[in-house]
């Protein structure tokens, strides 16, 4: 064709606005003297004498020079039409990657502005490599290869099988009819490594115990349990209407809570990351609620149980003055759990 | 292997204009940032230009700012510098480098030239 | 873009060690750590030592050794050894135009 096809749909040709355009008459031969005119209009914009052959030169165009334009030969066949688009190169887009787990990364993209032109995107990538390998071929085994782009998320490609220990160079290029600009982005998957929240979040009170809220949880579904990766979590909870979290970095799956506000409901959340601290702490998980069981059990009720109101009242108001809920120093002959020594001082005192 | 190979040097009068290239092999060009670096007789090294992986973004040492011109051809995995209004100064042995980059969120930083050709002699005189 | 500040010479038994140092300002040695150290035998292409302030690359000896401290970046060849007298030289990202620079050089020489 005497018409290079920009990709996009037929008979569309591309312009910067304020730049010089140069249409192309699609049906004959290149070289061949035609007239042109705008579509629906018989005045002539260039004639078959202009030098030009079979295209049109338009100085400098703007959105008004957009629309359809038809070009003649000299014998008055029409010999096409060519529809005129105008819009901007592309600009770097800007990328950034993520990881759930230790073995999969996910990129994501979007225009550094918008072209108003059809577009694509090029995603690749490939695994760098340390300097000095000068005497050997550059290994197969570090690509690059394609980006595969997830065909139900628009902008967002998947690198599979990752290696967590190594770095990868992202190759994202915005392709549109008027040029090509590329995006590099270094990736590591021990940086950008932030798990999903854990998920099943439960939090139960412990019969007996008005302090205390036992909380369970489990691994996101994201995250392939190995030995050689775990995760290590971080438990928040607070009373109903307290603005301020007490945190706790439980171990293992479950925490029990021992410095409740008795009677009242108390939110809990719980974020992960993996156990040797790369990358950040997960979003929290949605929160749970559970309120402390009311009331000891008959046989532990002790006879300073009367000036319990008033402990509690004292507790409402310490929550009220916004600093973190602490353990109540009053004496309480509940077994002992090994991880809250302050219980252990509270029955030692 | 992984090799550069130069060409394209010789003696140019003062004035006048050459077009140096580089040949690479054995890596995957396109995905490298690229650069000239050059040597007078019995002198250091001196960085000439920088050229990113897509030829869309380059560099140039203030001695040759709007004299030399770096391009790449990734289809042909070659990198060329085109030299024009040359000096006698310009006179020494030019490598071409290849490095791998770091490149972050916001730009990408020139970091060490670990692959280099054997050099092509440039000799600006009258 | 100025040279970095390197000494002309420096020299060493075999065996002892040798320190070259690479001073530049806040807005390349100081400013990043893209610090990267060649070696140049006569008449030879440069070869890469170091790279990103301390790391070697495959091949290197680990008699080479990189550091920084403010605006200078030094090199430490200890264990010398005859093969190692030649030129050094010591280049940084020059943080303007996405330039580089390179130090002003060192000669090493093996004594003995």
């Known amino acids: 064709s005497p018409c290079p096809q920009a990709w996009g749909p037929p008979g569309v040709q591309y312009g910067q606005p304020g730049r010089p355009v140069m249409l192309c008459c699609p049906g004959v031969s290149a070289g061949t003297p035609v007239s042109w005119f705008r579509d629906g209009d018989s005045r002539l914009l260039q004639g078959p004498d202009s030098g030009l052959g079979h295209r049109l030169v338009l100085a400098q165009v703007d959105s008004p020079d957009e629309g359809t334009y038809v070009c003649q030969t000299l014998d008055g066949v029409s010999g096409g039409m060519v529809t005129l688009k105008l819009g901007f190169p592309p600009a770097r887009p800007e990328v950034s990657c993520q990881a759930v787990d230790y073995e999969n990364f996910s990129c994501t993209w979007s225009p550094g502005q918008v072209s108003g032109l059809p577009t694509r995107y090029l995603t690749s990538y490939r695994k760098k490599t340390l300097p000095g390998a000068e005497s050997q071929r550059e290994s197969p085994s570090t690509g690059p290869w394609p980006c595969p782009q997830d065909p139900l998320e628009a902008s967002r490609c998947v690198v599979h099988g990752a290696e967590f220990w190594s770095e990868y160079r992202i190759n994202v290029t915005e392709v549109n009819p008027l040029g090509a600009s590329t995006c590099l982005l270094d990736v590591r998957l021990q940086s950008i490594l932030r798990p999903d929240p854990p998920q099943g979040l439960r939090v139960e009170s412990v019969p007996g115990y008005p302090r205390r809220l036992h909380a369970s949880w489990t691994y996101p579904a994201s995250w392939r349990r190995q030995p050689h990766f775990l995760l290590k979590f971080r438990l928040q909870y607070r009373p109903a209407q307290h603005p301020a979290w007490s945190t706790v970095e439980p171990i293992g799956l479950e925490e029990v809570i021992t410095d409740t506000v008795a009677g009242l409901p108390h939110a809990v959340r719980v974020s992960a990351r993996d156990f040797l601290d790369a990358g950040t702490w997960s979003a929290w998980s949605p929160e749970a609620w559970g309120t402390p069981s009311t009331g000891l059990l008959q046989d532990e009720i002790p006879d300073w149980s009367q000036g319990h109101g008033q402990q509690l009242e004292a507790v409402v108001a310490q929550e009220d003055s916004l600093a973190p809920a602490r353990p109540s120093l009053q004496p309480d002959p509940r077994p002992l759990d090994h991880r809250d020594p302050l219980e252990q001082v509270a029955v030692l005192a | 292997e992984v090799q550069l190979l130069e060409s394209g040097g010789g003696l140019v009068q003062p004035g006048g204009s050459l077009r140096l290239s580089c040949a690479a092999s054995g890596f995957t060009f396109s995905w490298y940032f690229m650069g000239w670096v050059r040597q007078a007789p019995g002198k250091g090294l001196e960085w000439v230009s920088y050229i990113y992986p897509s030829g869309g973004s380059t560099g140039y040492a203030d001695s040759v700012k709007g004299r030399f011109t770096i391009s790449r051809d990734n289809s042909k995995n070659t990198l060329y510098l085109q030299m024009h209004s040359l000096r006698a100064e310009d006179t020494a042995v030019y490598y071409c480098?290849?490095?791998?980059?770091?490149?972050?969120?916001?730009?990408?930083?020139?970091?060490?030239?670990?692959?280099w050709g054997q050099g092509t002699m440039v000799t600006v005189s009258s | 873009q100025s040279a970095l500040t390197q000494p002309p010479s420096a020299s060493g038994s075999p065996g002892q060690s040798v320190a070259i140092s690479c001073t530049g300002t806040?807005?390349?040695?100081?400013?990043?750590?893209?610090v990267s150290w060649y070696q140049q035998h006569p008449g030879k292409a440069p070869k890469l030592l170091i790279y990103?302030?301390?790391k070697r690359p495959s091949g290197v000896p680990d008699r080479f050794s990189g550091s920084k401290a403010g605006n200078t970046a030094s090199l430490t060849v200890s264990g010398l050894q005859a093969e190692d007298e030649a030129d050094y030289y010591c280049?940084?990202?020059?943080?303007?135009?996405?330039?580089?620079?390179f130090g002003t050089g060192t000669k090493v020489t093996v004594l003995g």
């Open positions: 990103e302030v301390t």
């Open positions: 280049s940084s990202y020059g943080g303007s135009n996405n330039a580089g620079v």
């Open positions: 480098a290849r490095d791998e980059g770091y490149c972050s969120s916001t730009s990408c930083y020139f970091d060490a030239f670990d692959i």
């Open positions: 806040s807005s390349d040695v100081g400013g990043y750590n893209f």
